[in-house]
C-alpha cells in the first residue's frame, strides 16, 4: 500500500522536512503532490512525468519545494503555514491512480524564557509571591525547577496559567532559593536564568552569648547578641530597662557587684518592622577568701589515731570539696564526712594515707582550693628483714648481716645473739667466724614515736659441711609450647656453687635451657613433653657437696591427633566393629566418637556387634584436654559390604 | 537401658569381710570402668576406688590400700567389691557406679546402694 | 590428694529464687569438675560435668560455671522438686574427691 512518511514529524521554524514515499507501485507515468487531504488543482504544488523527468510548479507552489524521481518531496526553510497534511497523486501507465496522505507540523523555535514575579521582598509568613515564566508562548509546556531539583511536593506550592505560573503561599525563609523555569515544545527547550528569591525576615528571639550568668568580681563582662533576620538585625541593650548602646557587642570591663542585674537585647528589622529582645540576669559575686586546712592530730599513729581535717574558714550555705592525691574521695568506712562536709575524719589512720589532701570552697562559678596538707603518719616498725638471705657460712669468712624495717620514724636497731644484746647499730658485723659463731640472730626494730617493737630471728650456720639442698619450682604443671618452669636450688648459701643434672646426666646444651642466679635457678623455656624428667640440684663448696632429691616435671600436653585402630575401613556385614581411639595426652583426654555427625559414648573403645550396611558412615573420635584447654579429632570412613560381595575384611 | 543391680543388705561384725556384687546392663561391660563409692549414714559421699572391666586394672584411695580388693566377672557382667577388717566407722550404703566415659568423666549411673552394718 | 570444699552447708531459699553453691578445689583441677544431686533416700544423679555441661535431661534452670579452683552451681529459679543435697566431684585423676554437700530447702 502507498504509505507517506515525514521525517521529521515535527518540524522547527525555518527547518526542512522530506515527505518520503514508501510502496510506489511500477509502471507509473507520473504523479503530483497537492497541498492538503485530497487532490485539488488549486491546491497542485508540483507535478512530474516520468517520461521526460519534467517537473511542473502548480498553483501552490513556494519555491522551497523540490520533487525526487523517487516521488519524495523535500520541502526547505519551513514556515508556520506549512503545518498540515500532503497528498501524493500517483498516474500509472494504465492510468488507474493512487493516492495517500501525509502530514507534519510546524513548531517555532522558543526564545530563552525569563522569570517575573509579583513582589521581589516578600515577609515571611505573611507575603505570596507569584513567578510567572515570559513569554507566553502557544504549544509550549512549562516547567519549573527549585534549587535544580524538580518542584517538591508541598501544600504551599501552586502551579496555574498552565503551569506558566508558580505560586508559593505563605513564604518562609526556607523558600529562599534559586528559582528557574522551563519552555519546551516538540522541537526546542530553554531554561531561564536563575531567580533568587529575597524572603524578609525575623528577627528571631536573640540569643546572649556566652550562657554564664555568674561572674566574679574584677572579670571583664563581653555579652554578644545574636538574632536570625533578613536583612540583618540592628542591635540595642539595656541594662536594668535603661538604654546602653546600639552595638552588637556590650563589653564592660573590670565588673563589680553592682553591674549585677537584667541585660536586655533587642534586634529590630527595619523592613518587617518586627522588634525582638531577650534577657539574662547577671549575677557578680565577689571573691571568696583562699580556704585552709587545719588538723587535730598532726603525727597521728598507724592503726591506732583518728585524724579530723577541717576546711576553714566556715562560710554559710557554701558548698565543701575535698581531695586526696590529687583525686575525689574513695569510697572507703574509713573516711567519714561531716554533714557540710567542711570536716573530713580519717579512722584508724595508715601509712598509705599521707595524703597530700586539699580542700575546697565552691561558689556559683569556680572551685577555690587550699594549699595541700600532708600528714606525717607514725607507722612501724615492720618486721625487720635481715640480709643478704644466706644461712649457712663456711668458717673463717666475715658475717656482715644488715637489718630494715619499715618505720616513720626511722627505726632504731638493735642486735642479738641467742638472746644475749650485742650493739644497737643496723649492721652487725663479725670478722672470720667460727662454727661457734652458730646460733640465733635477732634483730630488733624499735620506734621511739610509737613505742613498738618488732623481731626477726635467723639462724646462722658457721659449718664446712653443706645441708641437702631441695628444689623449688615456680610452675608444678607446665602446658606443653606455652609455659616456662623456673627451678630454684635451696637455700642461698654464701660462697657455694650449684649444680643441675637432668635424669642423672649433667645439663644438655640447649636454647630452652637457661641458668641465672649464679646458676641457682634452671629455667626451661616452652617446655615440652621430654621434659618431663627427674631434675636434681647440688651444692658444693671446697670442703663439701650434697644433692637435692629428684624433682619430676609433670608437663601437660595434647592431646595429639588421635590413632583409630585398626586401620581397616571395609568389613563384611556380620561382623563385629571394634574401633579404638588413642591420642597422646596428659592428663590422659576424654574420649567422645561421633557416627556421621552424631554423638554416640565417651569410652576410648567403639564396639558394635553383627554390623550391616545400614552401618556405613563416618566414624568419628574426638579428643579433649580441659588442662590444655586443647581438643583434636580423627574421622575415619567404615564400608559395610553384604556378605560376599567385598573382598574386605572381616573383623 | 543401662542398669547397675546390687546385692542385698549385709550385716557384719568388726574384724569380718564382706564382698558386695554389682551386675551391669543395658551397655557393653567391657567399654566402661566402674567405681565404687559409700556414704556413712547422714554424711556425704567417699570414693573407693574403680576398677577397668576389660583389663582387670584396679585403682584404690589410699585410705582403703591394703583392705579393699575389685574384681570382676566379664562372662556374668559382674563386679565385686571386698571390704575386709571391717569396723563399725565401715557402717554405709556402698554404691557402685559407672564412668561416663574413660579417663576424667564423672559418674553418669549408679547402683541402689547396698547397706553394710558392721555392730558386734 | 585433691580437697573439695562447698560453700555453704545448707541454704534455705523460696520458690522462684536464684540460688547458688560454690565449690573450692585445694589445687587446679581445671574444668575437670562435676556436680550431682541427691534427694532423701535416693542414689546421687549426675547433672553436670567438665564444669559446665548439662546433662542431657537435666532441667535448663541447672548451670555451672568456673574453671581453676573456684566452680558454682546456679539455680536460676528454685522449684519444689529442687529440694536436695548437691554434691560437687573433681574428675581430674584419681582419687576421685566430693565435697561435704550443701543441703537446699525451701523456705
Known amino acids: 500500500k502507498l504509505t507517506i512518511e515525514s521525517t521529521p514529524f515535527n518540524v522547527a521554524e525555518g527547518k526542512e522536512v522530506l515527505l518520503l514515499v514508501h510502496n510506489l507501485p511500477q509502471h507509473l507515468f507520473g504523479y503530483s503532490w497537492y497541498k492538503g487531504e485530497r487532490v485539488d488543482g488549486n491546491r497542485q504544488i508540483i507535478g512530474y512525468v516520468i517520461g521526460t523527468q519534467q517537473a511542473t510548479p502548480g498553483p501552490a507552489y513556494s519555491g522551497r519545494e523540490i520533487i525526487y524521481p523517487n516521488a519524495s518531496l523535500l520541502i526547505q526553510n519551513i514556515i508556520q503555514n506549512d503545518t498540515g497534511f500532503y497528498t501524493l497523486h500517483v498516474i500509472k501507465s494504465d492510468l488507474v491512480n493512487e493516492e495517500a496522505t501525509g502530514q507534519f507540523r510546524v513548531y517555532p523555535e522558543l526564545p530563552k524564557p525569563s522569570i517575573s514575579s509579583n513582589n521581589s521582598k516578600p515577609v515571611e509568613d505573611k507575603d505570596a509571591v507569584a513567578f510567572t515564566c515570559e513569554p507566553e508562548t502557544q504549544d509550549a509546556t512549562y516547567l519549573w525547577w527549585v534549587n535544580n531539583q524538580s518542584l517538591p511536593v508541598s501544600p504551599r506550592l501552586q502551579l496555574s496559567n498552565g503551569n506558566r505560573t508558580l505560586t508559593l503561599f505563605n513564604v518562609t525563609r526556607n523558600d529562599t532559593a534559586s528559582y528557574k523555569c522551563e519552555t519546551q515544545n516538540p522541537v526546542s527547550a530553554r531554561r531561564s536564568d536563575s531567580v533568587i528569591l529575597n524572603v524578609l525576615y525575623g528577627p528571631d528571639a536573640p540569643t546572649i552569648s556566652p550562657l554564664n550568668t555568674s561572674y566574679r568580681s574584677g572579670e571583664n563582662l563581653n555579652l554578644s547578641c545574636h538574632a536570625a533576620s533578613n536583612p540583618p538585625a540592628q542591635y540595642s541593650w539595656f541594662v536594668n530597662g535603661t538604654f546602653q548602646q546600639s552595638t552588637q557587642e556590650l563589653f564592660i570591663p573590670n565588673i563589680t557587684v553592682n553591674n549585677s542585674g537584667s541585660y536586655t537585647c533587642q534586634a529590630h528589622n527595619s523592613d518587617t518592622g518586627l522588634n525582638r529582645t531577650t534577657v539574662t540576669t547577671i549575677t557578680v559575686y565577689a571573691e571568696p577568701p583562699k580556704p585552709f586546712i587545719t588538723s587535730n592530730n598532726s603525727n597521728p599513729v598507724e592503726d591506732e589515731d583518728a585524724v579530723a581535717l577541717t576546711c576553714e574558714p566556715e562560710i554559710q550555705n557554701t558548698t565543701y570539696l575535698w581531695w586526696v592525691n590529687n583525686q575525689s574521695l574513695p569510697v572507703s568506712p574509713r573516711l567519714q564526712l561531716s554533714n557540710d562536709n567542711r570536716t573530713l575524719t580519717l579512722l584508724s589512720v595508715t601509712r598509705n594515707d599521707v595524703g597530700p589532701y586539699e580542700c575546697g570552697i565552691q561558689n556559683e562559678l569556680s572551685v577555690d582550693h587550699s594549699d595541700p596538707v600532708i600528714l606525717n603518719v607514725l607507722y612501724g616498725p615492720d618486721d625487720p628483714t635481715i640480709s643478704p638471705s644466706y644461712t649457712y657460712y663456711r668458717p673463717g669468712v666475715n658475717l656482715s648481716l644488715s637489718c630494715h624495717a619499715a618505720s616513720n620514724p626511722p627505726a632504731q636497731y638493735s642486735w642479738l645473739i641467742d638472746g644475749n644484746i650485742q650493739q644497737h647499730t643496723q649492721e652487725l658485723f663479725i670478722s672470720n667466724i667460727t662454727e661457734k659463731n652458730s646460733g640465733l640472730y635477732t634483730c630488733q626494730a624499735n620506734n621511739s614515736a610509737s613505742g613498738h617493737s618488732r623481731t626477726t630471728v635467723k639462724t646462722i650456720t658457721v659449718s664446712a659441711e653443706l645441708p641437702k639442698p631441695s628444689i623449688s619450682s615456680n610452675n608444678s604443671k607446665p602446658v606443653e609450647d606455652k609455659d616456662a618452669v623456673a627451678f630454684t636450688c635451696e637455700p642461698e648459701a654464701q660462697n657455694t656453687t650449684y649444680l643441675w643434672w637432668v635424669n642423672g646426666q649433667s645439663l644438655p646444651v640447649s636454647p630452652r635451657l637457661q641458668l641465672s642466679n649464679g646458676n641457682r635457678t634452671l629455667t626451661l623455656f616452652n617446655v615440652t613433653r621430654n621434659d618431663a624428667r627427674a631434675y636434681v640440684c647440688g651444692i658444693q663448696n671446697s670442703v663439701s657437696a650434697n644433692r637435692s632429691d629428684p624433682v619430676t616435671l609433670d608437663v601437660l600436653y595434647g592431646p595429639d591427633t588421635p590413632i583409630i585402630s585398626p586401620p581397616d575401613s571395609s568389613y563384611l556385614s556380620g561382623a563385629n566393629l571394634n574401633l579404638s581411639c588413642h591420642s597422646a595426652s596428659n592428663p590422659s583426654p576424654q574420649y567422645s566418637w561421633r557416627i556421621n555427625g552424631i554423638p554416640q559414648q565417651h569410652t576410648q573403645v567403639l564396639f558394635i556387634a553383627k554390623i550391616t550396611p545400614n552401618n556405613n558412615g563416618t566414624y568419628a573420635c574426638f579428643v579433649s584436654n580441659l588442662a590444655t584447654g586443647r581438643n583434636n579429632s580423627i574421622v575415619k570412613s567404615i564400608t559395610v559390604s553384604a556378605s560376599g560381595t567385598s573382598p574386605g575384611l572381616s573383623a | 537401658q543401662v542398669q547397675l543391680v546390687q546385692s542385698g543388705a549385709e550385716v557384719k561384725k568388726p574384724g569380718a569381710s564382706v564382698k558386695v556384687s554389682c551386675k551391669a546392663s543395658?551397655?557393653?561391660?567391657?567399654?566402661?570402668?566402674l567405681h565404687w563409692v559409700r556414704q556413712a549414714p547422714g554424711q556425704g559421699l567417699e570414693w573407693i576406688g574403680y576398677i577397668n572391666p576389660n583389663t582387670g586394672y584396679t585403682s584404690y584411695s589410699q585410705k582403703f590400700q591394703g583392705r579393699v580388693t575389685m574384681t570382676r566377672d566379664t562372662s556374668t557382667s559382674t563386679v565385686y567389691m571386698e571390704l575386709s577388717s571391717l569396723r563399725s566407722e565401715d557402717t554405709a550404703v556402698y554404691y557402685c557406679a559407672r564412668e561416663y566415659g574413660n579417663y576424667n568423666y564423672p559418674l553418669d549411673y549408679w547402683g541402689q546402694g547396698t547397706l553394710v552394718t558392721v555392730s558386734s | 590428694d585433691i580437697q573439695m570444699t562447698q560453700s555453704p552447708s545448707s541454704l534455705s531459699a523460696s520458690v522462684g529464687d536464684r540460688v547458688t553453691i560454690t565449690c573450692r578445689a585445694s589445687?587446679?583441677?581445671?574444668?575437670?569438675l562435676a556436680w550431682y544431686q541427691q534427694k532423701p533416700g535416693k542414689v546421687p544423679k549426675l547433672l553436670i560435668y567438665?564444669?559446665?555441661n548439662l546433662v542431657e535431661g537435666v532441667p535448663s534452670r541447672f548451670s555451672g560455671s568456673g574453671s581453676g579452683t573456684d566452680f558454682t552451681l546456679t539455680i536460676s529459679s528454685l522449684q519444689p522438686e529442687d529440694v536436695a543435697t548437691y554434691y560437687c566431684?573433681?574428675?581430674?585423676?584419681?582419687?576421685?574427691?566430693f565435697g561435704q554437700g550443701t543441703k537446699v530447702e525451701i523456705k
Open positions: 566431684q573433681h574428675h581430674y585423676g584419681t582419687p576421685y574427691t
Open positions: 543395658g551397655y557393653i561391660f567391657t567399654s566402661y570402668w
Open positions: 589445687e587446679n583441677i581445671y574444668g575437670y
Open positions: 567438665n564444669a559446665k
